[in-house]
């Protein structure tokens, strides 16, 4: 290389972290061999679960509000999952990403997309309830399955709006024992006249906005909205909180526990810049707490079944459906098709919050299971007896 | 070629002040970081100040802390150190040097040599 | 601040000989090091990088090695041209500090 070939300009700590060499240390080996395991677990699991959750909720449920903001949590855990696989890939061959610089932007953009996108979603749940119980009049009025559809559009168009700099600032850098990073680097697009100072600010920048937009704010919105529904429900002497209420804490919770590592190391690496002493507790910790907010992911399905027992019914009663199908004699599926029932339009009103965790009738056989094969996901239109009861005292 | 060409060497009386001057060419002098390194008369080699391409980030040993200060002027090419309150301490050959990337020295000076002494 | 210990000071050795110089931080300092070659009256000149990386134009009987906060700088078969002192260098937390450099002589 000539004297005057400027290489590729990488921040401190990125080049530092290239500099990281891999240890032969057999005991690291074993705890490799099992973040393989757990990583691959997680990602079957993950993909399962959120597949069967989009399922039974998309088609086998009764479309409400509350089942389509779980619909599209739902979806964004189902791409998050459907990225683990590859972050396994890359534990496997040794922490190398070995799938080119395109599908590292890609993959990296899925983990921050879901990210943005489980915040923002929450925000909106929590604010739904909000507004049902502070504004009811109103919720009644402007409460429709086709609002909140159009309302998560917006905000899958939010977020990834905001993954695009993690898009854009994502790269595959050679590390010098030959493994290759898939990782920031802040001074691939302008790097302005002084490098040091670039990367300072935008990693600081990075870390700080989706800290404030994928954690704080939606976190402060959902305290925030519990506290006005807290208050106005005390007034009206109500002390138990309903099914959805757990299941809304339960996915919160989650959420906070498995993002919350993941930014404070985030927002410690961006510090990191000015002190590198903080580097080795980053390079060290990032790496679990990524993966914890990965399972986040894989968490999810897991509390809406737990804290929802009709959803359990709703998923034992789908399952069976399936093996129905599989072992029935094609002789049976002549008139499959003519009954299957129309989706409820998608302009009508919710009746509770508590759609999700109630018991409409359902159709049985493998005639309902064609159907959804055939594209309509048909859900029974009838309100359950829970759903009823609780309609004006939902929370 | 890659040059660097110290000046601004001399002797000066202990409390003085001197400003050396690191001439660079053959390179893009503003992409890259520069530092300073000195050299006691048979001793070692001691770094002393370094300054990002842009010249908005600079650092120093608490040895040369609050007395010297690097800047450059990349329209000029060119890298200075200014020394102020000099001790005999401070005698050494002062060699300016480029930095690969975030690191580590690639070219260096001829060198100049700063003599504080009354 | 770290500290950098390089042991021999000095050594005597004939050409072809294999010669190994330590360099030891008080710290880990995570592969950021760097070996310099100074002869009497010149500037001193890289010879390697990232511990174990080995600068542009050096020979290939250099090799860098080593982790934490031990090093090595080894030339496989010294050669006349190599008689000079070494100093290690790291790169870890500023201020970045120099070995008290290793002279490597001719027996």
């Known amino acids: 290389m000539s004297a005057n070939a400027t290489l590729k300009p990488l921040c401190p700590i990125l080049e530092q972290m290239s500099r990281l060499q891999s240890h032969s240390n057999t005991s690291i080996r074993y705890i490799d061999h099992a973040a393989v395991l757990l990583h691959g677990l997680a990602s079957l699991l993950g993909l399962v679960e959120n597949g069967v959750i989009l399922f039974v909720v998309g088609c086998r449920m009764r479309q409400t509000v509350v089942t389509t903001w779980v619909l599209h949590l739902a979806l964004s855990d189902l791409l998050a999952s459907a990225s683990l696989p590859f972050f396994t890939y890359f534990l496997a061959v040794g922490h190398s990403w070995e799938l080119g610089t395109t599908f590292c932007k890609l993959h990296s953009s899925i983990f921050f997309l879901n990210m943005f996108a489980s915040g923002f979603l929450l925000s909106a749940i929590s604010l739904d309830r909000c507004l049902q119980v502070v504004r009811p009049v109103w919720a009644q009025n402007h409460r429709t399955v086709a609002a909140a559809h159009k309302v998560c559009l917006v905000l899958w168009a939010l977020a990834v709006l905001n993954t695009v700099p993690y898009f854009v600032f994502r790269d595959t850098i050679s590390r010098l024992d030959g493994r290759i990073m898939c990782y920031y680097n802040v001074l691939l697009l302008n790097p302005g006249p002084d490098r040091d100072a670039t990367c300072n600010s935008r990693q600081v920048a990075l870390a700080v906005s989706k800290f404030l937009l994928a954690f704080l704010v939606p976190l402060a919105i959902i305290a925030s909205s519990h506290a006005a529904v807290s208050l106005r429900l005390q007034h009206r002497g109500r002390r138990r909180p309903g099914r959805f209420v757990r299941l809304v804490a339960a996915v919160v919770a989650a959420f906070a526990l498995c993002w919350g590592p993941y930014h404070v190391f985030s927002l410690l690496e961006a510090r990191a810049h000015a002190n590198p002493g903080l580097r080795p507790l980053v390079w060290r910790g990032l790496p679990f707490v990524t993966s914890l907010a990965f399972f986040n992911s894989v968490a999810n399905p897991v509390l809406y079944v737990l804290t929802c027992p009709d959803m359990l019914r709703k998923l034992r009663r789908s399952l069976r459906t399936v093996l129905e199908s599989v072992l029935v004699d094609d002789s049976e599926l002549g008139g499959a098709g003519s009954s299957r029932r129309r989706r409820t339009s998608s302009t009508a009103r919710s009746a509770s919050p508590l759609a999700l965790c109630s018991r409409p009738e359902e159709p049985r056989g493998p005639a309902r299971l064609l159907g959804w094969l055939l594209g309509s996901c048909a859900a029974s239109p009838q309100t359950g007896p829970l759903n009823r009861a609780l309609s004006s005292t939902s929370s | 070629e890659v040059q660097l060409v110290e000046s601004g060497g001399g002797l000066v009386q202990p409390g003085g002040s001197l400003r050396l001057s690191c001439a660079a060419s053959?390179?893009?002098?503003?992409?890259?970081?520069m530092s300073w390194v000195r050299q006691a008369p048979g001793k070692g080699l001691e770094w002393v100040a370094v300054?990002?391409?842009?010249?908005?980030?600079?650092d120093y040993p608490g040895t040369v802390e609050g007395r010297f200060t690097i800047s450059r002027d990349n329209s000029k090419n060119t890298l200075y150190l200014q020394m102020n309150s000099l001790r005999a301490e401070d005698t050494a050959v002062y060699y300016c040097?480029?930095?690969?990337?975030?690191?580590?020295?690639?070219?260096w000076g001829q060198g100049t040599l700063v003599t504080v002494s009354s | 601040d770290i500290q950098m210990t390089q042991s021999p000071s000095s050594l005597s050795a004939s050409v072809g000989d294999r010669v190994t110089i330590t360099c030891r931080a008080s710290?880990?300092?995570?592969?950021?090091l760097a070996w310099y070659q100074q002869k009497p009256g010149k500037a001193p000149k890289l010879v390697v990088y990232?511990?174990?990386q080995l600068a542009d134009g050096v020979p290939s009987r250099f090799s860098g090695s080593g982790s934490g906060t031990d090093y090595t700088l080894t030339i496989s078969s010294l050669q006349p041209e190599d008689f000079a002192t070494y100093y290690c260098?790291?790169?870890?937390?500023?201020?970045?500090?120099f070995g008290q450099g290793t002279k490597v002589e001719i027996k």
């Open positions: 040097a480029r930095h690969r990337t975030n690191w580590d020295f690639d070219y």
């Open positions: 053959g390179f893009t002098f503003s992409s890259y970081k």
């Open positions: 300054i990002s391409n842009g010249g908005s980030t600079t």
């Open positions: 710290e880990n300092i995570y592969w950021n």
């Open positions: 990232a511990a174990t």
């Open positions: 260098q790291h790169f870890w937390i500023t201020p970045w500090t």
